[in-house]
């Protein structure tokens, strides 16, 4: 099941995933002047079995000038200018991306892809935070957030990271060992009578993906 909301925003910090849990989707968006090929995939999907995970579907972009069919109400405008993104979901290779079972690595770039990658995370996904350039971690508990299913609703745990305005940056896991948090997790990890297992999640995704992907948002 896809997470209902985005990971928490931490002032002066950004986040990224080191690897993507099976079921994660990535928009097949194209840069200015290009668009998804007709009948092309809307998303790449992280799928796999017990031994190997990989991205299904290929994102393909074609020049907008070659397009001869449209569903527009009004004429399509010129493609927007490329804009820099401050979000960590942009294309970048994590420093240390171990092969986690049931996870996909960062997909390689495709020709003429958009400047920002938009991922749709599933329950169980973990993202890691670091302070932006010019800020440092003042207090360091677990600098990660996990999407969890609690009482039938998804939520992200709150990362214990405070970034202060000093010319020093914190690092991603693998570059610096995080300090142990004295208080541990900020919220109690209460379990519910009804939970959704990873197996159920993946089975439901597989069953609904083919028929519902165009009209249903997995959120």
């Amino acid at each position: 099941e896809l997470c209902d909301d985005d990971p928490p925003e931490i002032p002066h910090a950004t986040f990224k995933a080191m690897a993507y849990k099976e079921g994660t989707m990535l928009n097949c968006e194209c840069k200015r002047g290009f668009r998804r090929i007709k009948s092309g995939s809307l998303y790449m999907l992280c799928t796999g079995n017990s031994s190997h995970s990989s991205w299904d579907n290929q994102c393909q972009c074609t020049s907008s000038a070659t397009r001869n069919t449209t569903k527009q109400v009004t004429p399509q405008p010129e493609e927007q200018k490329e804009r820099k993104t401050t979000e960590m979901q942009s294309p970048m290779q994590p420093v240390d991306q171990a092969s986690l079972p049931g996870h996909c690595r960062e997909p390689p770039p495709w020709e003429n892809e958009a400047t920002e990658r938009i991922y749709h995370f599933v329950v169980g996904q973990m993202v890691y935070y670091q302070c932006v350039q010019g800020y440092r971690a003042l207090h360091r508990g677990p600098a990660e957030s996990v999407c969890k299913m609690t009482h039938g609703k998804t939520r992200w745990t709150q990362p214990q990271l405070i970034c202060t305005g000093e010319m020093e940056t914190s690092q991603f896991p693998g570059e610096e060992k995080p300090q142990a948090s004295p208080e541990g997790r900020p919220e109690s990890e209460t379990s519910c009578l009804v939970t959704t297992t990873d197996f159920q999640i993946q089975t439901e995704m597989a069953a609904t993906m083919e028929t519902s992907i165009f009209t249903t948002e997995y959120q």
Epitope: P77, I118, T215
Partner: nanobody, 123 residues
Framework: EVQLLESGGGLVQPGGSLRVSCAAS????????MGWFRQAPGKEREFVAA????????RYADSVKGRFTISRDNAKNTVYLQMNSLRPEDTAVYYC????????????????WGQGTQVTVSS
């Protein structure tokens, strides 16, 4: 026929607020993503905000973060853009658009467009 009809534009003073609406008709309101774009005179159309089908996830252009809020009412087949702390540089025609993508921020990802509503910020 698919129709996206924007309304609520007008003249507002700097620092003021305005809410524009987009009513969808001609097809069930089942697009994965709805978005707002704007185009100022002599400039290219640019992304403003996007919202997921459930309304639980949103995306904003850096220039409007903290000032604009996108929301949707699926029961009314309507998406809204609440604009606060308006600035003269927000003056533009605001367009509503629909996409099969979730939370798309690129223009090419949107296939359905409204005619636009003019928002002018001036004293």
């Amino acid at each position: 026929e698919v129709q996206l009809l924007e309304s609520g534009g007008g003249l507002v003073q700097p620092g003021g607020s305005l809410r524009v609406s987009c009513a969808a008709s001609g097809r069930t309101f089942s697009w994965n993503g709805m978005g707002w774009f704007r185009q100022a005179p002599g400039k290219e159309r640019e992304f403003v905000a996007a919202i997921s089908q459930s309304g639980g996830r949103t995306r904003y252009a850096d220039s409007v973060k903290g000032r604009f809020t996108i929301s949707r009412d699926n029961a009314k087949n309507t998406v809204y853009l609440q604009m606060n702390s308006l600035r003269p540089e927000d003056t533009a025609v605001y367009y509503c658009a629909a996409s099969d993508f979730l939370l798309a921020t690129t223009i090419s990802a949107y296939d359905y467009w409204g005619q636009g509503t003019q928002v002018t910020v001036s004293s």
